[in-house]
């Protein structure tokens, strides 16, 4: 058993039939010695009397908010949550496995630039009685500060018969140098509580590996005289690290016909313009990627050929 | 990256082309090592990230773009020095910070070159003959060092009398390649920045 926060405790249980559970002693926060009684949640049934209450915690029915009283007055509370371990593995019932980039990916994180700011998100099918708290640091043995905001519900989607909820959090490394060469990874830890179930999820990464630039901006077409060719031009996204001559991007320009089956023409360039043939009813799309470190491509920015 | 890359103009900052070749070569070598040593801990998640140049050179700090010198987090260990030769300066008048930057890059390359050559000598003794260093990568390091053209004592190749532990050598190769790739990215960024300046 360990303290998650003031008056909230997590009991770690090996979860199998007839498991012995854990003997837990609860202490009433009072100088009083006599006339103390204990109850669980909203029930008025007295579980015991005295300054301490000894319980055997085996299942969710043993978890909850234990309250000590004296003469009708509440003295203190202790909320017990359960963390299940099945076959030596901690449960992961609350969050959905996103399976990208690999199995058992519960947290996904992205950064738009090298400023030390990043966003993580996760998915769940649970809609109520759910709380998250997020902590982060660079390195774990001598951790350096990363500040995370509150996790918020950022999207709701319908997946077949189920509703899926996306939560996200923004974090910022306290003293980040965009040009630094990372040798210690960022660690992100999410505590998830659903009703009386506690779980924790972690992710470890280098900012350089989670970079995904915003799409190029101000995508424009300029027809070339007496030709089917057009000059496509664009600019670096506002969110990308500066100076651009140091944090350079490379671009992929694609000409795509109306039908998905039509052959795509692709050009790669380090410049912010390219000359392509614009077919009728086609569209031109441009995306960006760090020129020197191949992390993710941005989403496409698109304009119609006409 | 297996994409077409435009060749630089002859009048371009002389080292940019070499640094682009360097990054391509080390990335290819790292990919080859990951594939060949698939049953060794050779991915970014599995290895310890060590920097053999730590406390010996200060490339990131010395080569910091002017725009980032206002960022206090980037200025933790800025040092200055008075090394002012080097042909990559291409007859431009330049501050000693730029000279320090280029000499720091040169020292990085020299240290990695020695490590890689020592390691290759060990790998050549491996009866499994599983992996060797790409001669192209070693040649590209050499070319960039020549283009930087700093006068520096040659460092003798480290020789070891004890029997090499090939497992440890291969893991060290992975660690070195990961670190060298990160440094090659920095070098490429620096050259691109200097070329635009």
């Amino acid at each position: 058993i360990w303290e998650l926060k003031k008056d909230v405790y997590v009991v770690e249980l090996d979860w199998y039939p007839d498991a012995p559970g854990e003997m837990v002693v609860l202490t009433c926060d009072t100088p009083e010695e006599d006339g103390i009684t204990w109850t669980l949640d909203q029930s008025s049934e007295v579980l015991g009397s005295g300054k301490t209450l000894t319980i055997q915690v085996k299942e969710f029915g043993d978890a909850g908010q234990y309250t000590c009283h004296k003469g009708g007055e509440v003295l203190s509370h202790s909320l017990l949550l359960l963390h299940k371990k099945e076959d030596g593995i901690w449960s992961t019932d609350i969050l959905k496995d996103q399976k990208e980039p690999k199995n058992k990916t519960f947290l996904r994180c992205e950064a738009k630039n090298y400023s030390g700011r990043f966003t993580c998100w996760w998915l769940t099918t649970i809609s109520t009685d759910l709380t998250f708290s997020v902590k982060s640091s660079r390195g774990s043995s001598d951790p350096q500060g990363v500040t995370c905001g509150a996790a918020t519900l950022s999207a709701e989607r319908v997946r077949g018969d189920n509703k899926e909820y996306e939560y996200s959090v923004e974090c910022q490394e306290d003293s980040a140098c965009p040009a630094a060469e990372e040798s210690l990874p960022i660690e992100v830890m999410v505590d998830a509580v659903h009703k009386l179930k506690y779980e924790n999820y972690t992710s470890s990464f280098f900012i350089r590996d989670i970079i995904k630039p915003d799409p190029p901006k101000n995508l424009q077409l300029k027809p070339l005289k007496n030709s089917r060719q057009v000059e496509v031009s664009w600019e670096y996204p506002d969110t990308w690290s500066t100076p651009h001559s140091y944090f350079s991007l490379t671009f992929c320009v694609q000409v795509q016909g109306k039908s998905k089956r039509e052959k795509k023409d692709r050009v790669f360039t380090d410049k912010t313009s390219a000359t392509v043939i614009c077919r009728k009813n086609a569209s031109i799309s441009v995306r960006a990627q760090d020129r020197y470190y191949s992390s993710s491509w941005s989403e496409w920015a698109s304009v119609p050929c006409s | 990256r297996n994409l077409p890359v435009a060749t630089p103009d002859p009048g371009m900052f002389p080292c940019l082309h070499h640094s682009q070749n360097l990054l391509r070569a080390v990335s290819n070598m790292l990919q080859k090592a990951r594939q060949t040593l698939e049953f060794y801990p050779c991915t970014s998640e599995e290895i310890d990230h060590e920097d053999i140049t730590k406390d010996k050179t200060s490339t990131v700090e010395a080569c910091l773009p002017l725009e980032l010198t206002k960022n206090e987090s980037c200025l933790n260990s800025r040092e200055t020095s008075f090394i002012t030769n080097g042909s990559c300066l291409a007859s431009r008048k330049t501050s000693f910070m730029m000279a320090l930057c280029l000499s720091s890059i040169y020292e990085d390359l020299k240290m990695y070159q020695v490590e890689f050559k020592t390691m290759n000598a060990k790998l050549l003794m491996d009866p499994k003959r599983q992996i060797f260093l790409d001669q192209n990568m070693l040649a590209v390091i050499d070319e960039l060092m020549q283009a930087l053209n700093f006068n520096s004592e040659t460092v003798p190749q480290k020789s070891s009398l004890e029997e090499p532990d090939f497992y440890k050598t291969k893991i060290k190769l992975c660690i070195l390649l990961h670190a060298f790739r990160i440094r090659a990215v920095t070098i490429d960024r620096v050259m691109s920045y200097l070329n635009a300046s």
């Epitope: 058993i1 003997m23 837990v24 301490t52 000894t54 203190s76 | -």
Partner: nanobody
Framework: EVQLVESGGGLVQAGGSLRLSCAAS????????MGWFRQAPGKEREFVGA????????AVADSVKGRFAISRDSAKNTVYLQMNSLKVEDTAVYYC???????????????????WGQGTQVTVSS
């Protein structure tokens, strides 16, 4: 601060009995539970028995169940470990421990106790 002093250890023959005492002094009013742990040469410290101070709930390790009993005298701020039918494998240094922190905890875990005595040697000969 709470000070703990163990006594009653010594040499005893297999099958014999000993009674260990642990006297607490200092801020004893904040005591929540007291326990006994032991450490045999070359082994890790292990839980023997414990008692919650105000209510007097007790727990003992499976290895000593039926042979050892734990009790307390609140007026004297003392906890006792009555050891009967001693075996050679009970030979160890016996430590007394006290918990003064409120909140939820586990009687069996040594890191849930915040004050410790110096220990008393118990040797059981065959």
């Amino acid at each position: 601060e709470v000070q703990l002093v163990e006594s009653g250890g010594g040499l005893v023959q297999a099958g014999g009995s000993l009674r260990l005492s642990c006297a607490a002094s200092g801020r004893t009013y904040s005591t929540v539970a007291m326990g006994w742990f032991r450490q045999a040469p070359g082994k890790e410290r292990e839980f023997v028995g414990a008692i919650t101070w105000s209510v007097g709930n007790t727990a003992v390790a499976d290895s000593v169940k039926g042979r050892f009993a734990i009790s307390r005298d609140s007026a004297k701020n003392t906890v006792y470990l009555q050891m009967n039918s001693l075996k050679v494998e009970d030979t160890a240094v016996y430590y007394c421990a006290s918990r003064t922190n409120i909140g939820a905890f586990n009687l069996f875990r040594e890191n849930h106790y915040n004050y410790w005595g110096q220990g008393t040697q118990v040797t059981v000969s065959s």
